[in-house]
Each structure stands twice: as C-alpha cells, then as structure tokens.
C-alpha cells in the first residue's frame, strides 16, 4: 500500500440519501394520488377496495414517535417492494379497462423502482440489514374479471397512497436522528 | 477530503492477536456503515466485516466468524477490528472502508508466520 | 471462491470499448440489491467506479458505463485509454451473508 492519500467526496452521501428518498417519495405520493383521482374519474369505486396480497399498512400517527431508523426502512423497503410486484401484474394482466392508464402505470412503476433503488443505496451506506422478512408471497392470479380488475387497481393505489403518506412522515422525522 | 488511516498491522505468530484501527476523517463518520476488506497478497478482495453506523449490527464473514470483532467509537471517528487466534491465511493488506463502500484507506498489511 | 463470477482477464486496444461482466444468484444480483464496481490501480487502494448498478460517483470519466439484468451486471469501459489497465472488482450486498460480496476480479491488459 502506497502513502496515505484522501478520496474525493462520492455525489451522495446517507444524509443526502435520505434527502433524496424523502423527494422521490413526495413526488411518487403526487403521482399516485393523481392516478387514484383519474381512476374514481372513469371507474367509480362503489366503497372502499382491498387485495388479501397487499402489505397491512405499517404505521400510524400514533407510532411514529417511537420509529426507529432500520425498522421504517426495512418495513418500507419490504412494502414497496410488494407494491411493485402489484403495480407490474396490473400492467400485465389488468385487462382492456387499464390499458388506457398503461402510460401512467409505467411511470409510476419507474418512480417505485427509482425510490426503491435509493432506500437501497441508503441502507447499504448505513450498513443496515437488507434482508426482507419472511413473509409468504401471494401468488398473484388473473384478475377474476374486468370489474375485478378495476376494483385491484383502486385497492393498489389507495393503499400505496397510504403507505407513501406514512413514509414521507417517517423519512422526515428520521432525518433528525442521522 | 475523505481521509481513512489504518495502523495497527504487523507481524505476528500463528494463534496470535493484533488490534487494527481506522482513523476517519473529512466526512461524518457517524452517519456511515464502515466494513474491513482484505487482500491476499496476489489476490482478490475478501471482504471480512461490517458494522452498522450506529453500531447496533455486526456482521462477519464465514472465514472471521468467532475469532474477529468489529467495534468503532463515533466520538473518536475510528474504527477498530479486534484478530484473535490469528491463523496463515490471515496473512493480507487490510482495508478500512466506508458506506457501500465508498470510501477505502490505504491499507496495513498484516503477516502471520512463525 | 468468488460468490460473484467475473472473467479473470480481458484486453483491448487504446479506443476500443471493452465489458467486464459479473454475475451473481439468487441472495444478491438477483435479489434486486444493487451492484457496484472498483477498480484498483497497480499497489494502490480500489477506488469506486460506479455504485447502484449505473450511477458515476463525480470525477469518474462518462467512459464508463454499468447494466445489469437479473442476475447479471456488466462494467462497459469505452475509449478505452492506456491508465484503464487495472484490476476491476463488481460488488454487491448479500442478503445471506448481511454484507457485500465481491468478484474474483478482472484484469483489464492495454495492448
């Protein structure tokens, strides 16, 4: 090994990072609350829409105090995750109805793959377990029909929308305590 | 500019102990997991440790497991890798390195012979 | 042995473009968790090329270029210049192992 010698500064660092992740989930929750909109606009939903595949929503206003820095970004990593895989079948298998919504899909699936490439590039700085938990992935079938297809979506967006609510809240207090 | 020194290396004899430490600075050190990677002489890198930024994860590898610790003091900026029971593979140049990594030291060379 | 394969050696001529490739399984590349690159200059300490798969820390020339698809990524070095000739490593987190692993290293020859 040569002389000590320092190394020029990388374009980020964790603080960054986690600057960065708070962003992209603000503009992803932007885009998802528009294509929810676009979706009650042309598919009205009748009530409230749930999939037994969907992660359970991971926080609440009254746990956010007590989060801790590898919990949110694990838990967030794993659900988003999850949302993708859901987000990729709706583009596969949403059927004729959806087809109309495949470029906003598209872009919404790009920004999931962004956010989730720096909640990696994150906790890799951070050293942070990567490993998602053992959960059972649900195989993901056919929509059982055009209607079922419709009401999956609702359930997906209004679901992701929840969690990236509860994540920009998280992210930002997190930011304190790095 | 991001500086990390190590020191601590040497020769030493096989069942042996030595204490390496990484001295970190020009950038927050607290905010960054920090690992060691070695290199046998001629060889590819291994890595060897990490330890979260916080210090609340450790992990080792296979080859480490039982006789290396990883510990760092965030007040101080360094980093420290305790080699117990020191063995002839051991022999290589240890690296400090920092976040993905981003960041490597030089490196200090450590020798197990008898 | 490797838990990333990478070929031990390649070559070019000054302007060519050359591409190192890695590949990993199922716990790291594959898992979705990025892949970064190094090289290491002869008796010196590697240095970060190119980390989450395609991104260039600054300073980092735009010769070089990173992909990678499923279980497999790749370190593409256009222009190929005289002070290429180096050592490059791919890494990448493994989610069984809670920490990175590194390929066996490629030898890039300047001919």
């Known amino acids: 090994p040569g002389p000590p010698a320092g190394s020029p500064r990388v374009s980020s660092d964790p603080r960054a990072d986690l600057d960065s992740a708070v962003l992209l989930t603000r503009s992803l929750l932007a885009d998802t609350r528009q294509l929810a909109a676009q979706m009650r606009d042309k598919f009205p939903a009748d009530g409230d829409h749930s999939l037994d595949s969907l992660p359970t929503l991971a926080m609440s206003a009254g746990t956010l105090g007590s989060l801790q820095l590898p919990g949110v970004l694990t838990r967030l990593r794993v659900d988003l995750m999850s949302y993708l895989r859901h987000v990729q079948w709706l583009r596969r298998a949403g059927g004729p109805s959806l087809k109309t919504l495949e470029p906003e899909l598209g872009a919404l699936q790009a920004r999931l793959e962004r956010l989730l490439r720096r909640l990696q590039l994150l906790m890799s700085r951070l050293a942070l377990p990567q490993a998602a938990p053992d959960q059972p992935v649900i195989p993901l079938g056919p929509p059982a029909s055009a209607w079922g297809s419709i009401r999956a979506a609702h359930a997906i967006l209004g679901g992701l929308h929840l969690t990236l609510d509860w994540a920009v809240r998280g992210l930002l207090l997190l930011k304190t305590r790095l | 500019e991001v500086q990390l020194l190590e020191s601590g290396g040497g020769l030493v004899q096989p069942g042996g102990s030595l204490r390496l430490s990484c001295a970190a600075s020009g950038f927050t050190f607290s905010s960054y997991g920090m690992h060691w990677v070695r290199q046998a002489p001629g060889k590819g890198l291994e890595w060897v440790s990490v330890?979260?930024?916080?210090?609340?994860?450790?992990y080792y590898a296979d080859s480490v497991k039982g006789r290396f610790t990883i510990s760092r003091d965030n007040s101080k900026n360094t980093l420290y890798l305790q080699m117990n029971s020191l063995r002839a593979e051991d022999t290589a140049v240890y690296y400090c390195?920092?976040?993905?990594?981003?960041?490597w030291g030089q490196g200090t060379l450590v020798t197990v012979s008898s | 042995q490797s838990v990333l394969t990478q070929p031990p050696s390649a070559s070019g001529t000054p302007g060519q473009r050359v591409t190192i490739s890695c590949t990993g399984s199922?716990?790291?590349?594959?898992?979705?968790?990025?892949v970064h690159w190094y090289q290491q200059l002869p008796g010196t300490a590697p240095k970060l090329l190119i980390y989450?798969?395609?991104e260039r820390p600054s300073g980092v020339p735009d010769r070089f270029s990173g992909s990678k698809s499923g279980t497999s990524a790749s370190l593409a070095i256009s222009g190929l210049r005289s002070e290429d000739e180096a050592d490059y490593y791919c890494a990448a987190w493994d989610d069984s192992l809670n920490g990175p692993v590194f390929g066996g290293g490629t030898k890039l020859t300047v001919l």
């Open positions: 989450s798969n395609n």
């Open positions: 199922s716990s790291n590349i594959g898992a979705g968790l990025d």
């Open positions: 330890i979260s930024y916080d210090g609340s994860y450790k």
């Open positions: 390195a920092a976040g993905v990594p981003d960041y």
